[in-house]
Amino acid sequence: IWELKKDVYVVELDWYPDAPGEMVVLTCDTPEEDGITWTLDQSSEVLGSGKTLTIQVKEFGDAGQYTCHKGGEVLSHSLLLLHKKEDGIWSTDILKDQKEPKNKTFLRCEAKNYSGRFTCWWLTTISTDLTFSVKSSRGSSDPQGVTCGAATLSAERVRGDNKEYEYSVECQEDSACPAAEESLPIEVMVDAVHKLKYENYTSSFFIRDIIKPDPPKNLQLKPLKNSRQVEVSWEYPDTWSTPHSYFSLTFCVQVQGKSKREKKDRVFTDKTSATVICRKNASISVRAQDRYYSSSWSEWASVPCS
Amino acid sequence: RNLPVATPDPGMFPCLHHSQNLLRAVSNMLQKARQTLEFYPCTSEEIDHEDITKDKTSTVEACLPLELTKNESCLNSRETSFITNGSCLASRKTSFMMALCLSSIYEDLKMYQVEFKTMNAKLLMDPKRQIFLDQNMLAVIDELMQALNFNSETVPQKSSLEEPDFYKTKIKLCILLHAFRIRAVTIDRVMSYLNAS
């Protein structure tokens, strides 16, 4: 058993049928010695008397808010949550496996640049009685500071019969140098509590590996005289690290017909313009990627050919 | 990425082309190592990230773009002195910092070159003959060092009398390649920045 926060405790259980569970001793936070009784949640049934209460915690029915009273007055509370260990592996019931980029990916994180700011998000099908708390650091043995905000519900989607809820959090490394070569990964830890179930999820990454630039901005077409060709031009996104000559991007320009089946013409360039043939009803899209370290491509920025 | 490679303009900063070749070569070598050593811990998540140049050179600090010198987090300064002549500087009036930067890059390359050559000698003794260093990568390191053209003492190649532990050598190879790839990215960024300056 360990303390999650004041008056909230997590009981770790080896979770299998007929498991013996864990013996827990609760102590009433009071100078009083006599006439103390204990109850669980809203029930008025007295579970025991005295300054301490010993309970055998086996299942969720044994978890909850234990309260000690004296003469009708509440003295203190202890909330017990359960953390299930199933065959040596902590349970992951609360969050959905996003399966990207690999199986058992519960937290996904992205950064728009090298400033040390990043966003993480996760999915769940649970809509109520759900709380999250996020902590982060650079490295784990001698951790350096990363400050995270509160997790917020950022999107709701319908997936078949189920509703899916996306939560996200923004974090900022306290003293980040965009040019630094990372040797210690960022660690992100999310505590999730659903009703009386506690779970924790972690992710470890280097900022360089989670970079995904914003799409190029100001995408424009300039027709070339007496030709079906057009000059496409664009700019670096505002959110990308500067100077751009140091933090350079490379670009992919794509001409896509109306039908998804039509062959796509693609050109790769390090410049912020390209000459392409504009077909009728086609659209031109451009996306960006760090020129030197191949992390994710940005989303496409698009303009119609017409 | 398999992209068409543009040939640099003749007037271009001479080291840019070499640094691009270096990044391409080390990236290919790392990919090859990951595939060949699939049963070894060779991925970024599995290895310890060690920098053999730590406390010996200060490339990131010495080569910091001017725009980032205002960022206190980047000014983790270390006192290091370097020799300040080099052919990459030939056509430009360059500051002492730029000379320091290129000299630091040269020292990095020299250190990695020695490590890689020592390691290759060990890998050639492996009866499994599982993996060797790409000669192209070693040649590209050499070319960039020649382009930088700094004079510095020759570092003797390390020789070891004891029987090599091939498992450890292959893990060390992965660690070295990961670190060298990160340094090659920095070198490429620096060359691109200097070319634009």
């Epitope: 979770w15 299998y16 049928p17 007929d18 299942e59 040596g88 019931d93 199986n103 058992k104 | 049963f39």
Partner: antibody, heavy 115, light 111 residues
Framework: QVQLVQSGGGVVQPGRSLRLSCAAS????????MHWVRQAPGKGLEWVAF????????YYADSVKGRFTISRDNSKNTLYLQMKSLRAEDTAVYYC????????WGQGTMVTVSS | SYVLTQPPSVSGTPGQRVTISCSGG????????VKWYQQLPGTAPKLLIY???QRPSGVPDRFSGSKSGTSASLAITGVQAEDEADYYC????????????FGTGTKVTVL
């Protein structure tokens, strides 16, 4: 006393279907994940499928994906394995078992796929 | 599709120490705990060892398990006639948990 009692095995022709059941007692069935494991005659153990305690997630071995469906009825304390498009190589003793560091196995039920 | 490799058979005389190896990789044994089962002819498997080296109550202390790196082993110290059975190791694969990964199985013969 934890008990898992299996039923539903038998002889079936290739391409046909069969449903196996596993009735649980002696524990809170709705709190635990459950597996199906099979063993072909004279061969080793092969994992078939898993279902979460609440039925929300199901996992299958590649060899049965798209043909077998694991399900549970927590109100009846019963686990099921619906097997469709059966093949000769599905011939095996099928076991249900609880998920956890200490596990309990059913007695097994024989499924023979033969024409 | 067995990812954990065991010797097909091992044998010993009563009282001898018999060991069975179970060889895996970084993604299974290297990352997860190992279980060992005993299966007597015509019966369901019985758990002998969980969590690499833990014995459930009721399992004789002549059975012991250990794990090192990407391999595990089961030792029967002072093998007895009633130990003649098939033995299976089991773990999980990092990317496909909760799918069970079983060993190929080992037939123990008491001479």
């Amino acid at each position: 006393q934890v008990q898992l009692v299996q039923s539903g095995g038998g002889v079936v022709q290739p391409g046909r279907s069969l449903r196996l059941s596993c009735a649980a007692s002696g524990f809170t069935f709705s709190s635990y994940g459950m597996h199906w494991v099979r063993q072909a005659p004279g061969k080793g153990l092969e994992w078939v499928a898993f279902i979460r305690y609440d039925g929300s997630n199901k996992y299958y071995a590649d060899s049965v994906k798209g043909r077998f469906t694991i399900s549970r009825d927590n109100s009846k304390n019963t686990l099921y394995l619906q097997m469709k498009s059966l093949r000769a190589e599905d011939t095996a003793v099928y076991y249900c078992k609880t998920h956890g560091s200490h596990d309990n196995w059913g007695q097994g039920t024989m499924v023979t796929v033969s024409s | 599709s067995y990812v954990l490799t065991q010797p097909p058979s091992v044998s010993g005389t009563p009282g001898q120490r018999v060991t069975i190896s179970c060889s895996g990789g970084r993604s299974n044994i290297g990352s997860n705990t190992v279980k060992w089962y005993q299966q007597l002819p015509g019966t369901a498997p019985k758990l002998l060892i969980y969590g690499n080296d833990q014995r459930p109550s009721g399992v004789p202390d002549r059975f012991s398990g250990s794990k090192s790196g990407t391999s595990a082993s089961l030792a029967i110290t002072g093998v007895q006639a009633e130990d003649e059975a098939d033995y299976y190791c089991q773990s999980y694969d990092r990317g496909s948990h909760p799918a069970l990964t079983f060993g190929t199985g080992t037939k123990v013969t008491v001479l």
